[in-house]
């Protein structure tokens, strides 16, 4: 029952497994399109290179049948029921492109000999680093380890002159695919994030979140959660806050900051805004169809996942390489390809790097501010405003862990 | 009036780092998008990165990874950190400012230009 890969003789093609449990509540036409887009620009970067070669994509839809419930906790075998469905079609192209969630993908990886490439926009757990043949082009779950250890650390700036060594970490179970999985790293003893920590404790319940912004014996000051500003107002509400509270709002797929008109609402006062840049080259971009800022990134990086496999297949072609080969199938990983937006790193173990933004609420202006960029590539945090208007005293980032003399906090009666 | 001074320039050995100041008059940093620009000798001027009003910094890929940019409003002086220089860095830098139509985004011109201050990597 041997599948033949539609990979040679001038014809090259990308499964796309098109399940109804993705990462993202994005229609499936959307990442249709992204695919479409993506073969358009691949068709003409070989055309412009002289390969005179045939590049397709074929959509392999999950009938939904038995995994209804759109929701990635409930996707273990789904990717498994659609390689099935290859292995009986008996066709495969050279590149596997799909799951998105960490589940399937774990699950696949787990029960197949993966001799081909597996590309996934999401696959955001722990449990999928560091696989030979998987390439993960949206932030996996490390790289948010290490920002938030680096930042943790990090004591010499004009605005952050203490490290931290405590965190409360808030996972109440309803969180998004991406948010789940990072918050799990988080939450996990033996990750890094845990490993370099003294404290470190995660709140399950709203009320545990609301009862630690005013605890005069809480043990840290320093909450992490994930999710959007509308995420955190449905928990905080305009509950007061003690004035030395830092919350980090994880947010990595966001681009809602980054429009013009976007007005900080006051609760977002305590809160430091973790997400990406919407592109930082200096050449602008026109990612033109028509996707709300949290849906963006999903299209792109399918998009992205197309371009990756166009350019791998150029090099392979224009140095008269095999395709089908473990060669082949290792080599998504440790390079630079000319993304959608500019250029797309991808670290030695196939994981995308990105450049994530730390963003505050200026007092002055209600409007969101960068205090910091950090590059996953070279775990380098690169400040930005040295001299931010912020809520806290003297406009700096308070200790981690209070001072226990007289109290100061604004009592809310 | 607005008005942009650079400083900082100077002669350093390939793999070495400078850092340069723009330092600025006339106007509010957070209304206003900033540009680093070079021009080497025989070449035309190049963006190396902007600095969008709201702090968001855009950078040409040949400087990606090694020059940074960061801004302090108390001094109304923007910086740019130059590190792993290498010999195709020569050239001068000049800052460039413009009022701010968008918060995230580069300008497609500037209206303000400093003098420049010159850059030499060499051993």
């Known amino acids: 029952s041997q599948v033949s890969q539609n990979c040679h003789n001038g014809s090259y093609e990308i499964s796309v497994l098109m399940m109804d449990n993705s990462a993202f509540a994005e229609p499936l036409e959307n990442v249709e399109d992204a695919v479409n887009e993506g073969l358009e620009i691949v068709r003409g970067r070989l055309q412009n290179a002289g390969l005179n070669v045939t590049v397709n994509a074929s959509f392999m839809y999950s009938d939904g049948l038995i995994h209804n419930s759109g929701d990635c906790r409930s996707s273990t075998c789904e990717g498994l029921d659609l390689l099935r469905k290859i292995s009986n079609a008996k066709r495969m192209g050279c590149v596997l492109m799909g799951p998105s969630c960490t589940y399937s993908t774990f699950q696949m990886y787990l029960d197949t000999e993966l001799s081909y490439p597996m590309i996934s926009a999401g696959s955001f757990g722990l449990s999928c680093d560091y696989k030979e043949t998987l390439t993960r082009l949206m932030s996996p779950a490390r790289k948010l380890t290490y920002f938030l250890v680096n930042f943790w650390k990090t004591n010499d700036l004009p605005f952050k002159t203490y490290s931290w060594s405590t965190s409360y970490v808030y996972k109440n179970g309803t969180e998004s695919e991406d948010c789940f999985w990072y918050l799990n790293a988080l939450e996990a003893s033996v990750s890094y994030f845990s490993h370099e920590l003294s404290f470190k404790l995660v709140l399950r319940q709203d009320k545990e979140f609301q009862d630690i912004l005013m605890d005069h014996n809480r043990k840290s000051n320093v909450i992490v959660m994930c999710g959007d500003p509308e995420f955190l107002y449905k928990l905080k509400g305009d509950r007061a806050v003690a004035e030395d509270i830092v919350i980090i709002l994880v947010d990595l797929f966001n681009d809602q900051y980054f429009e013009d008109n976007v007005t900080a609402p006051d609760y977002m006062k305590n809160v430091l805004v973790l997400t990406q840049s919407p592109g930082n080259s200096l050449l602008n971009s026109s990612f033109s169809r028509n996707l709300s800022p949290t849906k963006r990134d999903f299209a792109l990086a399918y998009l992205n996942g197309i371009l990756l496999f166009g350019h791998m297949l150029k090099t392979f072609l224009e140095n008269g390489e095999n395709i089908t080969t473990p060669k082949f199938a290792h080599a998504f990983r440790n390079l630079t390809f000319e993304g959608y937006d500019g250029p797309v790193t991808l670290d030695d173990w196939g994981d995308v790097d990105s450049t994530m933004v730390l963003l505050y609420t200026s007092v002055d202006t209600k409007k969101y501010k960068v205090l910091l960029t950090y590059d996953t590539h070279v775990n380098q945090t690169n400040p930005v405003d040295m001299s931010p208007t912020f809520t806290w005293k003297n406009s700096k980032l308070p200790n981690d862990i209070t001072d226990r003399g007289p109290q100061h906090h604004h009592h809310h009666h | 009036e607005v008005q942009l001074v650079e400083s900082g320039g100077g002669l350093v050995q390939p793999g070495g780092s400078l850092r340069l100041s723009c330092a600025t008059s006339?106007?509010?940093?957070?209304?206003?998008?900033i540009g680093w620009f070079r021009q080497a000798p025989g070449k035309e001027r190049e963006g190396v990165i902007c600095?969008?009003?709201?702090?968001?910094?855009k950078y040409a890929d040949s400087v990606k990874g090694r020059f940074t940019i960061s801004r302090d409003n108390s001094k109304n002086t923007l910086y740019l950190q130059m590190n792993s220089l290498r010999a195709e860095d020569t050239a001068v830098y000049y800052c460039?400012?413009?009022?701010?139509?968008?918060?995230?985004?580069?300008?497609?011109?500037?209206?303000?230009w400093g003098q420049g201050t010159m850059v030499t990597v060499s051993s």
């Open positions: 460039a400012a413009s009022g701010a139509t968008s918060r995230w985004n580069c300008p497609p011109q500037y209206d303000h």
């Open positions: 600095l969008t009003s709201g702090g968001l910094p």
């Open positions: 006339g106007f509010t940093l957070d209304d206003y998008a």
